[in-house]
């Protein structure tokens, strides 16, 4: 299954990145799981995961990073609390767990760069 | 003449950002010409541009917004004063002036991401 | 030394024709690596622009203005590009210049192409009369 995903993205100076993760449904889904997955340094980290119904809200765990909202076959995430470190891909997975049958599919990742902010001048 | 340049820099949240631009010099040039171009929006633009004796530092005109060292065929370009409206691929343009033959290298750019940086809250 | 001299320019009336030659000495076009050669031309008080290009495998490309009036071609044998120009109109005069780049072709779409462009000859001179 095919899932898209913009190539680049800048995190804003607050440490907040926001991209979609477009996927090519084969079948009528009403349960989707999206996982947001982080490749750096050869490594490949889990940054978040949510499932949904269809229609429904994303719904992150309450101590996740990232939020997330839904329409059709796109997912809005949002990743936040970024610093300079934490640049590198973030790849997409979706998974359509119900009904059968199970469909699979990993976008080729976004990179997001994170600039960590100067810090402001003491107010004396 | 091969000319290479890093893929991406990121500019510091203060606006400035560094890369290297190295060329492969066919000959023993004495006098060698410099020009950062900026590509965006299907247009060329130039940045700046510095003549320099091997051995001896870049002089960029007063106003211009780069300086730069030099240390055998390599130019250390520094780029400041930058905002998110200049991002953009700026391709390095290397040309030996002198002694003959003259030679041409153009590298295939360096995508500069700049984020304008948010303001600092008021100190009353 | 690696030298361009364009020739061919001159006067003539509306709806006439010039054929521009840019000969190279100091290297042949298939063992140097211009990618790309082109025609550029700069009227008095404006940026040079590019006319027409082509790339090492042939391929060419043109500047809307010239197109259906103007072709370009090269003969790799004598290291000659060619600038064959018909129907020219009052707005083509200026000075043209042949030059060289290490890129392909793809560039000379971009607005201040030139600017990725080196071994500028000295120009020929073209002025079309009403």
């Known amino acids: 299954m095919h899932v898209a995903q913009p190539a680049v993205v800048l995190a804003s100076s607050r440490g907040i990145a926001s991209f979609v993760c477009e996927y090519a449904s084969p079948g009528k889904a009403t349960e989707v799981r999206v996982t947001v997955l982080r490749q750096a340094d050869s490594q490949v980290t889990e940054v978040c995961a949510a499932t949904y119904m269809m229609g429904n809200e994303l719904t992150f765990l309450d101590d996740s990073i990232c939020t997330g909202t839904s329409s059709g076959n796109q997912v809005n995430l949002t990743i936040q609390g970024l610093r300079a470190m934490d640049t590198g891909l973030y790849i997409c997975k979706v998974e359509l767990m119900y009904p059968p049958p199970y469909y699979l599919g990993i976008g080729n990742g976004t990179q997001i760069y994170v600039i960590d902010p100067e810090p402001c001048p003491d107010s004396d | 003449m091969h000319v290479a340049q890093p893929a991406v820099v990121l500019a510091s949240s203060r606006g400035i950002a560094s890369f290297v631009c190295e060329y492969a010099s066919p000959g023993k040039a004495t006098e060698v010409r410099v020009t950062v171009l900026r590509q965006a929006d299907s247009q060329v633009t130039e940045v700046c541009a510095a003549t320099y004796m091997m051995g001896n530092e870049l002089t960029f005109l007063d106003d211009s917004i780069c300086t730069g060292t030099s240390s055998g065929n390599q130019v250390n370009l520094t780029i400041q004063g930058l905002r998110a409206m200049d991002t953009g691929l700026y391709i390095c343009k290397v040309e030996l002036m002198y002694p003959p033959p003259y030679y041409l290298g153009i590298g295939n750019g360096t995508q500069i991401y700049v984020i304008d940086p948010e303001p600092c809250p008021d100190s009353d | 030394q690696v030298q361009l001299q364009e020739s061919g320019g001159g006067s003539v009336q509306a709806g006439g024709s010039l054929r521009l030659s840019c000969a190279a000495s100091?290297?042949?076009?298939?063992?140097?690596?211009?990618?790309?050669m082109g025609w550029f031309r700069q009227a008095p008080g404006k940026e040079r622009e590019g006319v027409a290009a082509i790339d090492s495998d042939g391929s060419t490309s043109y500047a809307d203005s010239v197109k259906g009036r103007f072709t370009i071609s090269k003969d790799n044998a004598k290291n000659t590009l060619y600038l064959q120009m018909n129907s020219l109109k009052p707005e083509d005069t200026a000075m043209y210049y042949c030059a060289a780049s290490p890129r392909t072709c793809e560039v000379f779409s971009l607005g201040g192409s030139w600017h990725l462009f080196g071994y500028w000859g000295q120009g020929t001179q073209v002025t079309v009369s009403s």
């Open positions: 100091g290297y042949t076009y298939s063992s140097y690596n211009s990618n790309c």
